[in-house]
Structure formats: structure tokens, C-alpha cells
């Protein structure tokens, strides 16, 4: 991807960019491309939107191939129509404590975040808002059709759920880490971010990791068993190599992905871990990137894009990262 060779652009004409996205020259000054936006993957050839004060943060010098579009130090955040200064903490609602850092918002839930799966004593759990209370609570609905309960019970099991780490105090530092944000892509390779001060200087910093909730090419609905409405964590038949901007993971992974439902529910990562993955690029360069690996998924009706910004935020978090 070096810029010393002659400029040659794709055969098709310059792309039409979505509203609000700048058409810019790539990092070599060669071709017109749609600028990458905050939190998106960027490269020398795929630059970030300069009109929004974004730059491509490559992280450690060893990884100068692929970065994440990041706001310049001190960039404010716009959240729910309000502008917050970098470093400012605010309670976006009674449910969330948020922090703005260089254009990115990280939020910590103030309510419990467990995802409750059916169990023998509560086969139909449902979250409800109780009068006078901020946080929703779980209630157990009676089944509409008693006959369903009997034979199906053997399949129920309690799922371990992990909330945020309890607040830690270390050497005069109140350690706080927001949950990982939802993956920026519903399929294919995306980015997940969080804000933490869990470092030697107790300074807030943004962390990012690659994530893949499911491959785009997988036709998961075909795998749903007859009579079922969901496939929560489909089995991937063979180990796969991850691809990232033309670079390929050096190892193969038997990764877990989240499935799909046919009844309007969405399946999202429930428990995850973060592991380093080494990618080898066509020019022989090797780069190491942190990546989310799914342990379990949960299927629920609180799907991203619901009307309540906080509800969709709440359920689009990755709970219980073990890293």
C-alpha cells in the first residue's frame, strides 16, 4: 500500500457517499473515496473524515497498516442532542453513567445487566418497568400453553452472567472501565470500543478491538431446526481464517458466532473474551490486533435500533468480557 507507485484508481467512477460523509482523496493523494467515520477501520488508502476532525489511529507503531478512526484529542461528543466536553462525565438517564473522551462516549450501566435465560422455575422471563423504579426487573410470565413446558425442560440451563467488574481502587485511582460497545457491524469484521482508566497513569483512554458477530456470507436461517424460531450459537463446520483489509490471520480459529431468529428477536454476544490475533499481509508484514471472541450469545427482543436510545444502547453492550 505504499504511495510511491503511479496512481491508478478502480475502474468505476468516484463513489457516491452517504449523506454527511465526505468524498476525499485517499492517503496517497490518488483516488477519491468515501471518508471513514468515527470508530470505523481505516488504512493509508481509506482515510478518516478530515472535515470531522478524525484521524487514523494505528495504535502501536508495529501495526501501521490498519487503524481506527478516532477524534483528535479533546474533541467534544454529541450525545442525545447535547454537546459534552472531552473528559466530562454525565448521567444520560437514571440507567447510565457516561464519559466523553476525544469524541467517543463510553457508558456504564447503573442497573443490573443480566440476560436471563429460561429455567425450570422461570420458563418465560420478561423484563418489565415497575412504577416508581428506574431499573427494569425480571418477572416470570405464566406459559400460555402448559403443554410446551414438560418435554422442553431438559434443554433449559442457567447461563452464567457477568456484570461489570466491581469498582476497584488502586493506588489512589478509582478504576473504571465501560462495557465494550456493540460491534459496529452486524456481520463481517467490525470494531468494538470502550473507555477505561485501568492503566499506570490512571488516565482515561479509548481501547478498541476487532469483532465479528457472524460472517456475512452465512445463511444461518437455513440451520434453524424444524419447530424452532432461533439458532442462538450456530456450529461453524470448519475452522476459519479472519480477513482484515487484505491481510489474513496466521492461525485458523474455530470461532463461535451468534445466530438469528425468525420471530423478530435478535441474537447478540452475551459473554465474550478478548484475544490477540496476528494478521499477515500480502507484503509479508505481520500485525497484531485484539479481537473479540464470543463465548455465548443471547436472543432477545431488545434489538438495536429500537426507539429508546438508552434501551438499544443497553442491550447492544457486550456483557462479561473475560479479558
Amino acid at each position: 500500500q505504499n504511495c510511491s507507485g503511479p496512481c491508478r484508481c478502480p475502474d468505476e467512477p468516484a463513489p457516491r457517499c452517504p449523506a454527511g460523509v465526505s468524498l476525499v482523496l485517499d492517503g496517497c493523494g490518488c483516488c477519491r473515496v468515501c471518508a471513514k467515520q468515527l470508530g470505523e477501520l481505516c488504512t493509508e488508502r481509506d482515510p478518516c473524515d478530515p472535515h470531522k476532525g478524525l484521524f487514523c489511529d494505528f495504535g502501536s507503531p508495529a501495526n501501521r497498516k490498519i487503524g481506527v478512526c478516532t477524534a483528535k484529542d479533546g474533541a467534544p461528543c454529541i450525545f442525545g442532542g447535547t454537546v459534552y466536553r472531552s473528559g466530562e462525565s454525565f448521567q444520560s438517564s437514571c440507567k447510565y453513567q457516561c464519559t466523553c473522551l476525544d469524541g467517543a462516549v463510553g457508558c456504564m450501566p447503573l442497573c443490573s445487566m443480566d440476560v436471563r435465560l429460561p429455567s425450570p422455575d422461570c420458563p418465560f422471563p420478561r423484563r418489565v418497568k415497575l412504577p416508581g423504579k428506574c431499573c427494569e426487573e425480571w418477572v416470570c410470565d405464566e406459559p400460555k400453553d402448559q403443554t410446551v413446558v414438560g418435554p422442553a425442560l431438559a434443554a433449559y440451563r442457567l447461563e452464567d452472567t457477568f456484570g461489570p467488574d466491581p469498582t476497584m481502587i488502586r493506588a489512589n485511582c478509582l478504576v473504571q472501565t465501560t462495557e465494550w460497545s456493540a460491534c459496529s457491524k452486524t456481520c463481517g469484521m467490525g470494531i468494538s470500543t470502550r473507555v477505561t482508566n485501568d492503566n499506570a497513569s490512571c488516565r482515561l483512554e479509548k481501547q478498541s478491538r476487532l469483532c465479528m458477530v457472524r460472517p456475512c456470507e452465512a445463511d444461518l436461517e437455513e440451520n434453524i431446526k424444524k419447530g424452532k424460531k432461533c439458532i442462538r450459537t450456530p456450529k461453524i463446520s470448519k475452522p476459519i481464517k479472519f480477513e482484515l483489509s487484505g491481510c489474513t490471520s496466521m492461525k485458523t480459529y474455530r470461532a463461535k458466532f451468534c445466530g438469528v431468529c425468525t420471530d423478530g428477536r435478535c441474537c447478540t454476544p452475551h459473554r465474550t473474551t478478548t484475544l490477540p490475533v496476528e494478521f499477515k499481509c500480502p507484503d509479508g508484514e505481520v500485525m497484531k490486533k485484539n479481537m473479540m471472541f464470543i463465548k455465548t450469545c443471547a436472543c432477545h427482543y431488545n434489538c438495536p435500533g429500537d426507539n429508546d436510545i438508552f434501551e438499544s444502547l443497553y442491550y447492544r453492550k457486550m456483557y462479561g468480557d473475560m479479558a
Epitope: N2, G5, P6, C7, R8, C9, A14, L25
Partner: antibody, heavy 119, light 112 residues
């Protein structure tokens, strides 16, 4: 009709300067790279320089970099070649050409302007 | 620099016959994006050059189908299946994959 018209050529003494101009018409000028190619008398073609859509990137023949500069003015649909410290070996017909920047290079050529460097 | 060597330097062909011009590059001319930017230009007497073939084998718009390009790596060929009177002139191959961009020395096509 797509057209490129060069001007600014002429007789100049060694060490002198010339500025060649190329006026483009019949196409959206800012959607194309532009280039200069020269041809010495009785000789073959030689690429001189090209310039990207907005003039932020220019590439020149290494041996000419210190003396020649390519630039463009999209408002005037024009591309320029500033030639300084001219030498006898710079004597040639200078062609302005449109560079598609995609599949092909020089899909439209001007008629050329003659530069003669002689004392 | 990549040297483009054309053979023959001159060619005399009867009308209706086939003509073939070879162009060899001193090294591979595959661009870093994977494409090979090998082009052929014709300069008719007293005129500016005109594009015939780009990316080894793609015909430029308005170019008759009797012109065809082929080749890969370092060896490329321009063929004119049935030479017509208007085809006379000097043919140049050109590589645009590496700096400096370079032309072959030219092949003069004459009609017998």
C-alpha cells in the same frame, strides 16, 4: 467535443524559462488527471509529468524534478508546465494529455506545442 | 527504469495482411493493485498519438476490432488482423505500472 489546446511554446535560450498552458474543454476537467508528454525531433515519446484531480499530488520524471513543475487551475480548466533552466535537450513537441486515472492513461491528446532551446 | 523494447523497429505489410509487433519489458509490469498497465498508442504521420489498447488487451473506444493486444509478465504483442491504409504510422507500447512511466522506442508500420 473533448479538446485540449496547448500554448506557450517558442524559441528560448539555454537557461531560460517557459510556461506551457493547456486549455481543456468538452469534459468535467476536475474529474481527470492531466499529464505532459514530450517528443524530441525524430525521436519517440517521453512521459514528463502528471497531476491528480485537484493538484495536491504531482509526479514528474526524476531527471526533470528540479527544473519542471506541473500545476493546474480547475476554475480555468487549465493545466500548466513551468520549465526553468532550459537545456538544448529539452527541445521537443510538448503534448498535453488527459489521464483517466483508472483503466487507461492518455485517452485524449492535444496537438502539441513546440519548444526550441537554442542560442 | 523499466526499458520497453519493441521489435521490429519497422514493418512493411501489404493491405489486408496481418501485422504483429512485440514489446518486451525489462521487468514485470504488474502494478501493486494487481493490474498490468500496458498500453499501445498509434501516432499517424503529422498527428498526435492516439490510444489503441489499454490494460494489455482492452480496446479503447472507437478502435476497430482488427486491433488486439495480448501478453503477460514481460512479453506483450499487438496484432492488426487486416491492415488498412489508415493504419500506417508509428506504434508505441507504454507501461504505466511503475515510475518512471516509459514508452517503447516505436515501430514504424509501412504499407507495401
Amino acid at each position: 467535443e473533448v479538446q485540449l489546446v496547448e500554448s506557450g511554446g517558442g524559441l528560448v535560450q539555454p537557461g531560460g524559462s517557459l510556461r506551457l498552458s493547456c486549455a481543456a474543454s468538452g469534459f468535467t476537467f476536475s474529474d481527470y488527471y492531466m499529464a505532459w508528454v514530450r517528443q524530441a525531433p525524430g525521436k519517440g515519446l517521453e512521459w514528463v509529468a502528471n497531476i491528480n484531480y485537484e493538484g495536491s499530488r504531482t509526479d514528474l520524471l526524476a531527471s526533470l524534478k528540479s527544473r519542471f513543475t506541473i500545476s493546474r487551475d480547475n476554475a480555468k480548466n487549465s493545466v500548466y508546465l513551468q520549465m526553468n533552466s532550459l537545456r538544448a535537450e529539452d527541445t521537443a513537441v510538448y503534448y498535453c494529455a488527459r489521464d483517466t486515472s483508472r483503466g487507461s492513461y492518455f485517452d485524449v491528446w492535444g496537438a502539441g506545442t513546440t519548444v526550441t532551446v537554442s542560442s | 527504469d523499466i526499458v520497453m523494447t519493441q521489435t521490429p523497429l519497422s514493418l512493411s505489410v501489404s493491405l489486408g495482411d496481418q501485422a504483429s509487433i512485440s514489446c518486451k519489458s525489462s521487468q514485470s509490469i504488474v502494478h501493486y493493485n494487481g493490474n498490468t498497465y500496458l498500453e499501445w498508442y498509434l501516432q499517424k504521420p503529422g498527428q498526435s498519438p492516439q490510444l489503441l489498447i489499454y490494460k494489455v488487451s482492452s480496446r479503447a473506444s472507437g478502435v476497430p476490432d482488427r486491433f488486439s493486444g495480448s501478453g503477460s509478465g514481460t512479453d506483450f504483442t499487438l496484432k492488426i488482423s487486416r491492415v488498412e491504409a489508415e493504419d500506417l504510422g508509428v506504434y508505441y507500447c507504454f507501461q504505466g505500472s511503475h515510475f518512471p512511466l516509459t514508452f517503447g522506442q516505436g515501430t514504424k508500420l509501412e504499407i507495401k
